[in-house]
């Protein structure tokens, strides 16, 4: 499911519960996706020893995965709500091609991989409603994404395993950073 249980506005199972605010819904959605990533990481870590490798050992890769930096305004130091929100949405849009790559990369967690992908789309929609400056958000070029996807899928098995691990780790870190920032807003 792309939305955590009980999050659908049509859910009537708990009529006395206060409806979630926009911020609470976003917070819960990110935690839901992080749980999904955790399950996917379990499968990849069981298959290879890459999870034990230090970040330095895995740093040499050609992936241009979104990453938070000081200039993005999401850290405690130099925090800027609007700049940060733009970075979070832009970063999530950039991750979408990598989440597409993750589909069919899992045997026992195929549904989980799909749930992470769909939940991220929902999260982007939630965040776009919150953002004031939508013009500043650049959407990735579909043609560039298509060729990137083809290139990633053409890698040998070892590189595909490495790519899967790096995507999951980077996406987890990006979401954790985003959550810390959103909780300051």
């Amino acid at each position: 499911a792309p939305v955590p249980p009980g999050e659908d506005s049509k859910d009537v199972a708990a009529p006395h519960r206060q409806p979630l605010t926009s911020s609470e819904r976003i917070d819960k959605q990110i935690r839901y996706i992080l749980d999904g990533i955790s399950a996917l990481r379990k499968e990849t870590c069981n298959k290879s020893n890459m999870c034990e490798s230090s970040k330095e050992a895995l740093a040499e890769n050609n992936l241009n995965l979104p990453k938070m930096a000081e200039k993005d305004g999401c850290f405690q130091s130099g925090f800027n709500e609007e700049t940060c929100l733009v970075k979070i949405i832009t970063g999530l849009l950039e991750f979408e091609v990598y989440l597409e790559y993750l589909q069919n990369r899992f045997e026992s967690s195929e549904e989980q991989a799909r749930a992470v992908q769909m939940s991220t789309k929902v999260l982007i929609q939630f965040l776009q409603k919150k953002a004031k400056n939508l013009d500043a958000i650049t959407t990735p070029d579909p043609t560039t994404n298509a060729s990137l996807l083809t290139k990633l899928q053409a890698q040998n098995q070892w590189l595909q395993d490495m790519t899967t691990h790096l995507i999951l780790r980077s996406f987890k870190e990006f979401l954790q950073s985003s959550l810390r920032a959103l909780r300051q807003m």
């Epitope: 990110i30 935690r31 992080l34 955790s38 230090s54 970040k55 330095e56 938070m68 930096a69 000081e70 850290f75 405690q76 925090f79 870190e173 979401l175 954790q176 950073s177 959550l179 810390r180 909780r183 300051q184």
Partner: antibody
């Protein structure tokens, strides 16, 4: 797996001091690291945390005076403008970074910093 | 800024007693709360995280409950090695806070 703090000593007020947290049996690059201090006979006081290589967060009292930095094997706590109120045992602790909430599941034994003239 | 208030600050109990310590957050922190045990001259030790999940190697006489703003640590049957100071810690947000920890509860022998 263990953590060890070093660098604690007797210093005079105003002297800068750097404490170092060293990991054994694992790489710090895969974890978040926090610093916590405890004045004699008092409770635990959270100082700050380093997440990745450059994201940090600090307690309001630590902002501007304390700086946390990280390499693959060590995490440093740089302290400036020290006063007698900074006299405490300083602990570093590891957060396994697997979840979104901060929790510290591996601690060093602490290093004592005494600020006195 | 989130503040953590722990009570009582100290209590006296006997071996075999049921002991309850409470912790209150100034705003909702979901279930993102941990409990630590500290003995004199030693580093703190993680007992419980996510409000109710027992850390590895922690005896089952320790339990945690709560969500939102109100949390409880319970020791069902106090053992001699349980006399120590206990701290709660919020892990919800470490930005713009004075302290992530509660003030502590010292459990002494009656």
């Amino acid at each position: 797996q263990s953590l060890e703090e070093s660098g604690g000593r007797l210093v005079t007020p105003g002297t800068p001091l750097t404490l170092t947290c060293t990991a054994s049996g694992f790489s710090l690059s895969n974890y978040y690291v926090t610093w916590v201090r405890q004045a004699p006979g008092k409770g635990l006081e959270w100082i700050g945390i380093i997440y990745g290589s450059d994201e940090t967060a600090y307690a309001t009292s630590a902002i501007g005076r304390f700086t946390i930095s990280k390499t693959s094997t060590t995490v440093d706590l740089k302290m400036t403008s020290l006063t007698a109120a900074d006299t405490a045992t300083y602990f570093c602790a590891r957060d396994d970074s697997s979840d979104w909430d901060a929790k510290f599941n591996l601690w060093g034994q602490g290093t004592l910093v005494t600020v006195s003239s | 800024a989130i503040q953590m208030t722990q009570s009582p600050s100290s209590l006296s109990a006997s071996v075999g007693d049921r002991v309850t310590i409470t912790c209150q957050a100034s705003q909702s922190i979901n279930n993102e709360l941990s409990w630590y045990q500290q003995k004199p001259g030693k580093a703190p030790k993680l007992l419980i995280y996510r409000a109710s999940t027992l850390a590895s190697g922690v005896p089952s006489r320790f339990s945690g409950s709560g969500s939102g703003t109100d949390f409880t640590l319970t020791i069902s049957s106090l053992q001699p090695e349980d006399f120590a100071t206990y701290y709660c810690q919020q892990g919800y947000s470490l930005r713009n806070i004075d302290n992530a920890f509660g003030g502590g509860t010292k459990v002494e022998i009656k």
